[in-house]
Interface confidence: medium
């Protein structure tokens, strides 16, 4: 069959018409539906809204719709024994203590069951000593801490602000440094914007609002318990001791009025320059330990978290295609919330939910897409993407052969100032001629494409007249897809402005201020970012599923592949002298790259002449694109990572939201200069370049014609 | 925090060579996480990217000024350069220098500098 003989409309026109069905009205409507009550994890409310979107996919018109459960390792503040931090006198007496719960918002004062601040999976313990401050906890505030300031962490609770990188990442940072306990605080610099009102009057965040949040450093695993393996009803647990990812010292997260009252009394060191103060009216001083008249006043940490095996619940729909049903484009977001989601996951829900509907709408006009959709409702994203990838675990061979593409749909905002798309790069293309055809919703630029708009705001650093697309991290449920399993992957969202705007995510990210009118009042009043990022997921979705050849360009992985050897190379050369000792060369790596550049522009000239009318032979060309990603895959993982197997991306180990290219090479070169045994470190490098270049050349290869 | 400055004449005349250099303060110009690009933006137009260096001299090039341009780099003052040759008045721009990387919140730019040319 030819794709068309699966519809009586064009395809041209099915886009167009699955776009003018997408409505922002839907989208608000759907928002506000999802936002009345919190949806936690492991929760009965969230297992509700579960079956409650199970039943309104089924009537949208999806073919089949099923809730697929596991029980993993979830984690929750104690409801009689409520976590806290003091100050204690030389008598041990408490003399402040940190609020126990966020202020409602106003018409949330009545509402029950919202979870209080907590850092999931802290360990239980009461930890007390003396304070460090250790600025973003990251890999280079330790350096700067321990290598040039001299100041050890050993046996000390530090305080640390959120932003620049991923929680888990500064606890694993903590641990490492020897602390027995750490304080997350939201500082001003990051999350109050100069100009803008603290919520409810604005969208900063007020004094008394806490960013929750899990601390876990999973690498990919999923459930702490079973890694590599669905948690289902004969699954083979852990113990708790040999879990995987779990933090080993107690961690709690607070607001700046309480910060303020920490962080003013430090003594000690001064902050070595202007990057480690914030905006507080405290001196930002290191510590260790409070200063003169406060010097025996200690800070006490009171954590009663407790970790519990919970079941949780995915919804996933099908819509099945036509022509080629044993091929799958996949639509997924969370469900799962900290409190009411207004932002984070909701308005991503919200899209998902209306791109169904106007899927459903098509199919009951006796349309079908060309592959089969699969669109997904994860649970549990916000403790560790455990929904997702349970899922993926447990359907793993089917979606290695017949996984096509996964589009993320988790936030569709984080601002209103112009689109973020991170993704594959053979999704570049896709992504430019979409937008080029759809409308920017952004002021000033009335009847102008979101490409244009995108562009001028956004422009990529080195490809002028282009956008900028960012490499994919991790920290949202596209990991398991992109990161393990090596397929294409890509996700998109309206952003804020990164030039003005400094402070990191959006201010009230994962409070109990992330509300419905959040969104309407200060975001989005009219919907029309969401509609904008609705129609980019779903008409990629859509392109995707039905266009008879892949909407993929290998040649632009060429480019990046060049970019980012490049890239390596330069960190390699800051090391010239022992790169001629131990005879380390990027001449296997550069080769390869250059064998890929190449036979990607081979196979595009092929593709472009091929009989498009032969059924055997479009499906081998589009096999050729699907399985490129999956060519990327390494079985072996990367050292101590053992599901980020993908060899040119993984997330960072400094920082999980955030891609590194090259990982294998960059950890190896990564402070290889303080390494006890040069020899073998260097020896690591090389063996890095190895697998890198094996792997661009192997990719490469699955390119070259057949036979 | 890191920030960057552009000094430079404001006023060159056609034919001869634009030279700009970025002082780079709150931070090494070492850091191998980076790159640190030029960028233009003509009256009224959007910004067009000139090229980038990696602070060990690695460089790349908007092909469409390849000819006509060196970007440097001097780690011992934290700085880097531009020069670009012949010059007309379609080159007359507010050049600006950048910090850049992979990731979004990489990306910082100077407050700009304008260079006019004409006789």
């Known amino acids: 069959k030819s794709s068309n003989e699966a519809t009586n409309i064009t395809p041209k026109h099915n886009m167009k018409a699955f776009l003018d069905e997408l409505k922002a009205e839907n989208i608000k409507k759907f928002l506000y539906n999802f936002t009345q009550i919190p949806h936690l994890a492991g929760t009965e409310q969230n297992f509700q809204l579960a079956k409650q979107i199970q039943s309104q996919w089924k009537e949208f018109g999806l073919d089949s719709v099923e809730l697929a459960h596991y029980d993993v390792l979830l984690s929750y503040p104690n409801k009689t024994h409520p976590n806290y931090i003091s100050i204690i006198n030389e008598d041990g007496n408490e003399i402040f203590n940190t609020s126990l719960f966020e202020p409602p918002p106003p018409g949330y004062e009545n509402v029950s069951d919202i979870v209080p601040p907590f850092s999931a999976f802290s360990p239980q313990g009461m930890p007390e000593g003396d304070l460090v401050y250790v600025n973003y906890a990251r890999t280079e505030d330790f350096f700067k801490l321990e290598r040039d300031m001299k100041i050890n962490c050993s046996g000390k609770i530090v305080i640390a602000r959120y932003g620049k990188v991923f929680r888990g990442n500064k606890v694993k940072n903590a641990q490492l440094a020897g602390a027995k306990g750490v304080i997350l605080y939201s500082d001003p610099a990051d999350y109050f914007a100069p100009g803008v009102k603290s919520y409810p009057d604005g969208w900063n965040l007020p004094g008394g609002g806490v960013q929750r949040g899990n601390i876990l450093n999973l690498n990919g695993a999923g459930d702490p318990l079973t890694p590599g393996y669905p948690a289902n009803e004969y699954a083979y647990r852990r113990g708790i001791a040999e879990a995987v990812g779990l933090p080993s010292i107690p961690v709690h997260p607070i607001g700046y009025y309480d910060a303020q009252k920490l962080l003013e009394k430090m003594g000690g060191s001064a902050p070595p320059d202007s990057s480690w103060r914030g905006s507080l009216k405290v001196p930002y001083n290191v510590g260790p330990g409070f200063t003169g008249n406060f010097s025996t006043q200690k800070v006490k940490m009171h954590i009663h978290s407790t970790n519990e095996v919970t079941r949780i619940y995915n919804v996933i729909g099908t819509l099945r295609g036509a022509v080629e049903p044993d091929r799958y484009v996949i639509l997924g977001g969370h469900r799962d919330s900290w409190v009411f989601g207004g932002i984070d996951p909701q308005s991503g829900a919200a899209v998902v939910h209306e791109i169904v509907r106007s899927f459903g709408t098509l199919k009951k006009e006796g349309w079908r897409p060309r592959r089969t959709i699969l669109f997904a409702s994860w649970d549990a994203e916000e403790f560790g993407l455990l929904g997702s990838t349970e899922w993926a675990e447990e359907n793993s061979r089917l979606l290695q052969e017949r996984g096509v593409a996964y589009i993320n749909a988790d936030s569709s905002i984080e601002g209103n100032y112009t689109l973020r798309v991170d993704c594959t790069p053979l999704m570049y293309s896709l992504v430019h001629n979409l937008t080029k055809e759809l409308k920017s919703p952004d002021e000033g630029f009335e009847g102008k494409s979101l490409y244009e708009s995108w562009t001028k705001k956004s422009p990529s650093p080195e490809f002028s007249g282009m956008p900028r697309i960012s490499k994919l991290g991790s920290g949202n449920d596209f990991e398991v897809f992109f990161q393990r399993l090596g397929i294409a992957s890509g996700r998109a969202r309206y952003t804020k402005n990164w030039e003005t705007n400094k402070f990191s995510g959006y201010p009230l990210y994962h409070s109990v201020y992330e509300t419905y009118e959040l969104v309407e009042k200060f975001y989005d009043p009219m919907f029309k970012y969401h509609l904008t990022v609705a129609q980019v997921r779903g008409g990629m979705v859509f392109e995707l599923a039905n266009s008879i050849v892949l909407p993929f360009d290998c040649r632009d992985y060429a480019v990046v592949l060049r970019k980012y050897a490049d890239k390596i190379y330069s960190i390699s050369m800051k090391h010239p002298q022992e790169m001629k000792t131990y005879s380390v060369s990027f001449d296997s790596l550069f080769s390869a790259v250059k064998n890929f550049t190449e036979i990607a522009s081979k196979f595009s000239e092929r593709l472009q002449d091929f009989d498009k009318s032969n059924p055997i032979v479009l499906r081998m060309m589009n096999d050729q694109l699907m399985f490129l990603e999956r060519a990327f895959i390494d079985p072996l993982g990367l050292p101590d990572r053992p599901f980020y197997r993908h060899v040119i991306y993984a997330p960072s180990s400094h920082n999980k939201y955030a891609g590194e290219s090259f990982p294998g090479i960059y950890d190896a070169l990564f402070d290889i200069e303080s390494k006890v045994d040069p020899s073998k470190a260097w020896g690591e490098v090389k063996r890095q370049i190895y697998v890198a270049a094996f792997t661009v050349q192997a990719a490469a290869e699955t390119l070259s014609e057949v036979a | 925090q890191v920030q960057l400055q552009e000094s430079g004449p404001g006023l060159v005349k056609p034919s001869q060579t634009l030279s700009l250099t970025c002082t780079v303060s709150?931070?090494?110009?070492?850091?191998?996480?980076?790159?640190w690009s030029w960028i233009r933006q003509h009256p009224g137009k959007g910004l067009e990217w000139i090229g980038f260096?990696?602070?060990?001299?690695?460089?790349h090039y908007n092909p469409s000024l390849k000819s006509r341009v060196i970007i440097s780099v001097d780690t011992s003052k934290n700085q880097f350069s531009l020069k670009m040759s012949s010059v007309t008045a379609a080159d007359t721009a507010v050049y600006y220098c950048?910090?850049?990387?992979?990731?979004?919140?990489?990306?910082?730019r100077g407050q700009g500098t304008l260079v006019t040319v004409s006789s």
């Open positions: 709150g931070g090494s110009i070492s850091n191998s996480g980076y790159y």
């Open positions: 260096i990696y602070y060990n001299g690695s460089i």
């Open positions: 950048a910090r850049d990387g992979d990731d979004y919140g990489d990306y910082l």
